[in-house]
Interface confidence: low
């Protein structure tokens, strides 16, 4: 029969002959011949493969590198890399978290419009109208002016962005 | 090459403030965490705390809160640890380093608190 | 606070001979993420302290692997194998894995 151009899925083509692919897990150690299949071995410890494959190299895990900031997020197998997050307080500087740098607060005027994850920044958002915050926070959002007015009380001080309104007795009735 | 260094050896009086500078080069300085750690005469290492020089926002152990102050001048790279009130017990050397996980070290800075 | 106790004040030792440093702590450090927040230093005579080991058994850039951490949960070991004078000092254990830190008391490695 004719030797074939092209092979089936999981399929590769060599020496005019198709060959199985090493699974996921495992890289190639010989390729198949005539008499024989195409031999493969499971990846060591620390390594992987995560497609159908005819490597003779496992992929090493990504390592997590706490000089970086980083930790291990989800452990590697023989068919998946290491997924690295970064330590608390901190977040990725990439797609592929390769290092972390430190989550931003929010500066007095302005509060947390979402709070910062492994892989992403603090957002923060300006405190508008009626509402403040006085503090630099990681945390904190934009906190609503005191409304003297269910406490009977009146404005004696206007808000601003950074600070509470605040709050005063009424003016007693004049003789 | 990354280095911390420290401000010089510092002889104090009770009741005096001192301030203890650690400047950084080699890297992003508010990249990192900076930690203080105290080691007093002829004693093992305490950690003091540690601040964020993106935010400047400081932690402190229990041990050291109230009198000590952390804080960073991000422009210069570099990091300060103020004592007020300086009490004997203080006499020790400090130690800037880097977090994570305390892998470079400044060379100390000796403070000596006598009447 | 978590309590980190290294019961040998000191270690003599012969050059060429292998030493064992342990080091308890009176909590677990597994922290939820899977990772032990156990490290090692050493404090050379007159210098600052220098990261050996973190994360237990993972061997700091630039140390020689002479040097090698194991343990678990509460118990943590730091072997030196073939001890060289240069490795006199004091030796810390310090926990990472919750506020405040904390050191050991430490343990002095003495060439006999």
């Known amino acids: 029969p004719e030797p074939p151009t092209a092979c089936r899925e999981k399929q590769y083509l060599i020496n005019s002959q198709c060959c199985s692919l090493c699974q996921p897990g495992q890289k190639l150690v010989s390729d198949c011949t005539e008499f024989t299949e195409t031999e493969c071995l499971p990846c060591g410890e620390s390594e992987f493969l995560d497609t159908w494959n005819r490597e003779t190299h496992c992929h090493q895990h990504k390592y997590c590198d706490p000089n970086l900031g980083l930790r291990v997020q989800q452990k590697g197998t023989s068919e998946t890399d290491t997924i690295c997050t970064c330590e608390e307080g901190w977040h990725c500087t990439s797609e592929a978290c390769e290092s972390c740098v430190l989550h931003r607060s929010c500066s007095p005027g302005f509060g947390v419009k979402q709070i910062a994850t492994g892989v992403s920044d603090t957002i923060c958002e300006p405190c508008p109208v009626g509402f403040f915050s006085n503090v630099s926070s990681a945390f904190e959002k934009c906190h609503p002016w005191t409304s003297c007015e269910t406490k009977d009380l009146v404005v004696q001080q206007a808000g601003t962005n950074k600070t509470d309104v605040v709050c005063g007795p009424q003016d007693r009735l004049r003789a | 090459q990354i280095q911390l260094v420290q401000s010089g050896p510092e002889l104090k009086k009770p009741g005096e403030t001192v301030k203890i500078s650690c400047k950084a080069s080699?890297?992003?300085?508010?990249?990192?965490?900076m930690n203080w750690v105290k080691q007093a005469p002829g004693k093992g290492l305490k950690w003091m705390g540690w601040?964020?020089?993106?935010?400047?926002?400081?932690t402190y152990a229990d041990d050291f809160k109230g009198r000590f102050a952390f804080s960073v001048e991000t422009s210069a790279s570099t990091a300060y640890l103020q004592i007020n009130n300086l009490k004997n017990e203080d006499t020790a050397t400090y130690f800037c380093?880097?977090?994570?996980?305390?892998?470079?070290w400044g060379q100390g800075t000796t403070l000596t608190v006598s009447s | 606070d978590i309590v980190m106790t290294q019961a040998a004040p000191s270690v003599p030792v012969t050059p060429g001979e292998s030493v064992s440093i342990s080091c308890r702590s009176s909590?677990?450090?597994?922290?939820?993420?899977?990772?032990?927040?156990l490290y090692w230093f050493l404090q050379r005579p007159g210098q600052s302290p220098q990261i050996l080991i973190y994360?237990?058994?993972n061997l700091a850039s630039g140390v020689p692997d002479r040097f090698s951490g194991s343990g678990s949960g509460t118990a943590f070991t730091l072997r030196i194998s073939r001890v060289e004078a240069e490795d006199v000092g004091v030796y810390y254990c310090?926990?990472?894995?919750?506020?405040?830190?904390?050191f050991g008391s430490g343990t002095k490695l003495e060439i006999k």
């Open positions: 380093a880097r977090k994570p996980p305390f892998d470079y």
């Open positions: 080699g890297y992003t300085f508010t990249n990192y965490g």
């Open positions: 601040i964020n020089p993106y935010t400047g926002e400081p």
């Open positions: 909590k677990s450090l597994l922290h939820s993420n899977g990772n032990t927040y």
């Open positions: 994360r237990v058994s």
């Open positions: 310090m926990q990472h894995v919750e506020y405040p830190f904390t």
